[in-house]
């Protein structure tokens, strides 16, 4: 049903869903802090623009009685329950921030007439792609897929002279929310990744993964997995690995690799880590000081959601346009705004663009080094280290199929 929005006469409210089920196990207090910090910045920016308006946030908490798993598995209905609560209280703001779980976002989008924008810190799955009023501020699975296909096809770099067309994907069901949907997208038979590969097999058991590492009859030398180095070590340990195995470790929301004193453990030498280019000013900010690297990105997405709303509000007010219109609801895309840590770009479908960074372990220094970067906005690769000190033969990434001749 149509809910009246608290979104006019110089007073603009943001509805923030504080759900028990969340993409990252983050205390809600930290998210509140991030939102409040964002509000302070927005108020300052609006004031500087000569716009004398009030911007506030209303935090809508789930009762937690039914949906209490804490992760995203039981989130499907929680978002709808919160929406019902908002509806009953007639407390809808100009914009909805949250949910972060793919299940709940998909269900909310499906079951409601969204005439207001929804901003999500998460909703990584392919089922949340191409939604007209949904904005996602953490890299969705589609962006990862496009990088991987681009990288697989590359054969014109001095360190990658073979096109790849095969892969194993390790997915055992215990992944974090982001990893679950990233791997789910790679597994899906109808996805772009599957369409572009000639061979792809999902490994679901630890033993399957371990056996592949030295199996002479393996169908691919490349294994994609998602998680941190510790996750890989638990699985791989100190087992011997065939010299032409390449493990691609997707660990987007972890900037520990860029810290000065970090040394790469020996088990990472056959691994390329895919992560995001780190922010700089975040490390010392008040809301992020006590957060782990992953949670920092999650809290930052909430903060940037507030800044995005402020950016759009400023534009519409300066143009004398109404906020409670479909035009406003559909406007949160194809733009760049000033985020907390620099410019944030959203693509035509409201998904955040970013610089992905592919790292390798230098056999000389035992440090993580940048091999290349990839701009998801223009789908372009930028080589960084043209002569990497790889563990692989001739300082080149091997062919994806053992014994196949040069390309």
């Amino acid at each position: 049903s149509q809910v009246s929005q608290n979104c006019h006469n110089g007073s603009y409210e943001i509805s923030v869903l504080m759900m028990g089920n969340s993409a990252f196990a983050e205390p809600l207090k930290n998210l509140e802090d991030a939102v409040n910090e964002g509000l302070e910045i927005v108020r300052g920016r609006l004031q500087n623009a000569g716009l004398n308006v009030t911007v506030n946030a209303t935090f809508m908490y789930s009762d937690g009685l039914i949906h209490n798993s804490g992760d995203c598995r039981s989130s499907t209905c929680e978002g709808l329950d919160l929406l019902r609560k908002i509806s009953n209280a007639q407390r809808m703001g100009c914009v909805l921030i949250g949910p972060s779980c793919t299940y709940s976002t998909f269900q909310m989008y499906l079951d409601t007439e969204l005439s207001y924008p929804m901003i999500s810190a998460g909703s990584f799955g392919l089922s949340c792609d191409y939604k007209e009023t949904l904005t996602r501020l953490m890299s969705p699975a589609r962006k990862l897929m496009y990088f991987l296909v681009n990288f697989w096809k590359t054969n014109d770099l001095p360190f990658k002279t073979y096109s790849w067309s095969t892969s194993y994907v390790y997915k055992n069901g215990t992944e974090t929310e982001d990893c679950f949907w990233y791997l789910n997208a790679l597994e899906a038979s109808v996805s772009y990744f599957s369409h572009e590969l000639g061979f792809k097999v999902v490994l679901r058991q630890d033993k399957e993964f371990q056996d592949i590492l030295m199996d002479h009859n393996r169908k691919s030398n490349v294994i994609i997995m998602c998680g941190g180095p510790e996750f890989l070590y638990k699985l791989k340990g100190d087992r011997a690995v065939a010299e032409d195995i390449v493990i691609i470790l997707v660990d987007l929301f972890n900037d520990q690799y860029f810290e000065d004193n970090v040394t790469a453990p020996d088990y990472m030498k056959n691994v390329l880590v895919l992560t995001l280019s780190p922010g700089n000013s975040l490390l010392n900010s008040s809301f992020s000081r006590n957060l782990s690297p992953t949670k920092r990105d999650f809290a930052l997405a909430y903060l940037n959601g507030i800044l995005l709303f402020g950016h759009m509000l400023k534009i519409f007010l300066e143009n004398g346009e109404n906020i409670t219109t479909p035009k406003f609801a559909h406007a949160f895309r194809n733009l760049t705004f000033e985020g907390y840590d620099g410019p944030v770009t959203l693509d035509d479908w409201g998904d955040v663009d970013s610089t992905m960074v592919l790292l390798y372990t230098s056999v000389d220094t035992k440090k993580y080094k940048v091999l290349l970067t990839y701009d998801t906005h223009v789908n372009k690769t930028y080589p960084v280290d043209m002569s990497p000190t790889f563990t692989w033969k001739n300082s080149k990434l091997p062919n994806d199929i053992t014994g196949r001749g040069p390309q």
Epitope: N155, D156, L157, T161, T373, S387
Partner: antibody, heavy 118, light 106 residues
Framework: EVQLVQSGAEVKKPGASVKVSCKAS????????MNWVKQAPGQRLEWMGV????????NYNQKFKDKATITRDTSASTAYMELSSLRSEDTAVYYC???????????WGQGTTVTVSS | EIVLTQSPATLSLSPGERATLSCSAS?????MYWYQQKPGQAPKSWIY???NLASGVPARFSGSGSGTDYTLTISSLEPEDFAVYYC?????????FGGGTKVEIK
């Protein structure tokens, strides 16, 4: 419009050093690797090394590892190459060239002539 | 390192004629890159990834080849095409250039 403007010609005595600059404009300096290429009279082009301005990663051609030192000043969008212990065989035109993968060396500076003579 | 051998060293032709420049690599490469250089000027990117024309290069130029043998072809020479052309590989590190083919007016 992308432009790479190099410093002027230099005449140096054997044993001296010279620092050649390459100022980039018309694009984001830190987005693209910068290469240095040598062209000695009557010789083929020789690639000397490449630097990534964003991360500071530098790869040298082994042949020039002890001869050239590549640096940059990102605030000035400028790359530098210093040649040390100059000898007559270092007499050449030195070019900087931007890497715009997949089109390697898509823009070149106008070249800096270094003459080593006693 | 990969050695690139260009032939002929000099090609004497008249405007309107077809020019075929060859570049042979000492070992197989995936792609070849070509540059044009005129006297007193810096080289210019001309063809990248074997067959892609760089920005502003006329359609009378084409590139082809695979493995160790690559060709740059000018279908009908124009006066401004007389220059030295260099091939270059970046398949192996370090990148290397050929010795050049000078296309001169007959």
């Amino acid at each position: 419009e992308v432009q790479l403007v190099q410093s002027g010609a230099e005449v140096k005595k054997p044993g001296a050093s010279v620092k050649v600059s390459c100022k980039a404009s018309g694009y984001t300096f830190t987005d693209h690797n910068m290469n240095w290429v040598k062209q000695a009279p009557g010789q083929r082009l020789e690639w000397m090394g490449v630097m990534n301005p964003k991360f500071g990663t530098i790869n040298y051609n082994q042949k020039f590892k002890d001869k050239a030192t590549i640096t940059r000043d990102t605030s000035a969008s400028t790359a530098y190459m210093e040649l040390s212990s100059l000898r007559s065989e270092d007499t050449a035109v030195y070019y900087c060239a931007r890497d715009n993968y997949p089109n390697y060396f898509d823009y070149w500076g106008q070249g800096t002539t270094v003459t080593v003579s006693s | 390192e990969i050695v690139l051998t260009q032939s002929p060293a000099t090609l004497s032709l008249s405007p309107g004629e077809r020019a075929t420049l060859s570049c042979s690599a000492s070992s197989s490469v995936n792609y070849m890159y070509w540059y044009q250089q005129k006297p007193g000027q810096a080289p210019k990117s001309w063809i990248y990834r074997t067959s892609n024309l760089a920005s502003g290069v006329p359609a009378r130029f084409s590139g082809s080849g695979s493995g160790t043998d690559y060709t740059l072809t000018i279908s009908s020479l124009e006066p401004e095409d007389f220059a030295v052309y260099y091939c270059q590989q970046y398949h192996d590190y370090p990148p290397t250039f050929g010795g050049g083919t000078k296309v001169e007016i007959k």
